[in-house]
Interface confidence: low
């Protein structure tokens, strides 16, 4: 997926042969090619046209491969394949193609804020993360905690605020928000830091 700052395409690789590779030293590289190389060449690029990055395989039994993708190329197709070297043997994956724009994972929304409106509703508002190249949809997750009762709800909205009516007095509301591309494929951001708002008792 593409980080929220749009500078790095992160490819997480999870091997189906965990046990095999656990017993051997192995190295993983990601070979990729950006579309400008392909303009005057066949559909399958030549071996020499690929760039190669080393993948860090110490992360949660996955490998993290960082591919620099220029912002201007987000809509283009990125071709890539994995090369795994273990015990003198080279394994190579089939060629994969992705559009980075479809794989953007935004940063979490910012400035989560709650207030009671004049008509007694709870207004939840937040700011869109910076640098996102398209409008986002947001998932608002909130729980209502009244003495021994906890109720949870979530709502998908395209605005950067949500009005919750019929709120309970003397209750606390814990809210988190995350974002994803509105009008196409994408990856949900991490949840924002939870905020808690307590309504006054009657």
């Amino acid at each position: 997926w593409l980080k929220g700052d749009l500078k790095l395409f992160i490819c997480y690789v999870e091997s189906l042969f965990k046990n095999l590779f656990r017993n051997y030293n192995y190295k993983v590289h990601l070979l990729y090619v950006l579309p400008e190389v392909l303009e005057d060449s066949p559909l399958v690029p030549q071996k020499g046209s690929f760039q190669m990055v080393h993948c860090n395989c110490s992360v949660h039994e996955c490998c993290e491969c960082l591919v620099p993708v220029p912002t201007a190329k987000l809509n283009d197709t990125l071709l890539m394949c994995l090369k795994i070297t273990s015990g003198g043997v080279i394994f190579q994956s089939p060629l994969m193609s992705v559009q980075p724009i479809n794989m953007v994972k935004p940063d979490p929304p910012l400035g989560l804020h709650m207030e009671i409106t004049d008509d007694g509703n709870l207004k939840i508002s937040w700011s869109s993360p910076p640098l996102v190249p398209f409008p986002l949809q947001y998932q608002v997750k909130y729980s209502e905690n009244s003495t021994t009762v906890i109720r949870e709800a979530d709502k998908i909205v395209s605005a950067t605020s949500l009005l919750v009516d019929s709120i309970l007095p003397g209750s606390s509301y814990e809210v988190q928000v995350r974002g994803k591309r509105l009008d196409g494929p994408g990856i949900w951001s991490d949840w924002s830091t939870p905020r808690v708002f307590t309504t006054q008792d009657v």
């Epitope: 009244s146 003495t147 009762v149 109720r151 709800a153 709502k155 949500l162 019929s166 309970l168 003397g170």
Partner: antibody, heavy 122, light 108 residues
Amino acid sequence: QVQLVESGGGVVQPGRSLRLSCAASGFTFSTYGMHWVRQAPGKGLEWVSVISYDESNKYYADSVKGRFTISRDNSKNALYLQMNSLRNEDTAVYYCARDRPFGLVTGWFDPWGQGTLVTVSS
Amino acid sequence: DIQMTQSPSSLSASVGDRVTITCRASQSISSYLNWYQQKPGKAPKLLIYAASSLQSGVPSRFSGSGSGTDFTLTISSLQPEDFATYYCQQSYSTPPITFGQGTRLEIK
């Protein structure tokens, strides 16, 4: 203003079917859970069914489970109750009622429609 | 299922009286208790939600109290338009949502 209007009631024989509708206006229908509550003549209120705002959750009273189906069409601001295999004891005024918004199903009912009478009789 | 029991089933009172209706739950329902008023031939109307919160537009002579299993609806000074049937309803353990059997308030 917020308004709920039920329709579709009438006299029907035992074992037959009937479909009730509830037309909503004056609020963003697609964000609210909706209920059906009934009241037999001279009796108290009995909850029948609820549907969440996005149709992901539907629940029924044991007395109607397997016979009644709740549904909604958010594009038409409409709530429905399909009643099959009707029995004499289903005779009642049927009310639709709005719940709390955004998935907080099973809060309180406000407002209610005016009700539609279903009479099951041979 | 949680059973809701109202008392009394009916009561007679005069205009200006202070009236109290009680509702008891078969198990603790915290503050998830609502009160409705229903007049003959009409739909019920929400009066009190969350045990003690007055619904918008409802006169302040209506009040609710209680928590856990025992709840009360109080009308501080009965008005002619208050003669109706009153229902409590729990929204703690649902579904099913359960109502009390109703309390009929009549003119003495």
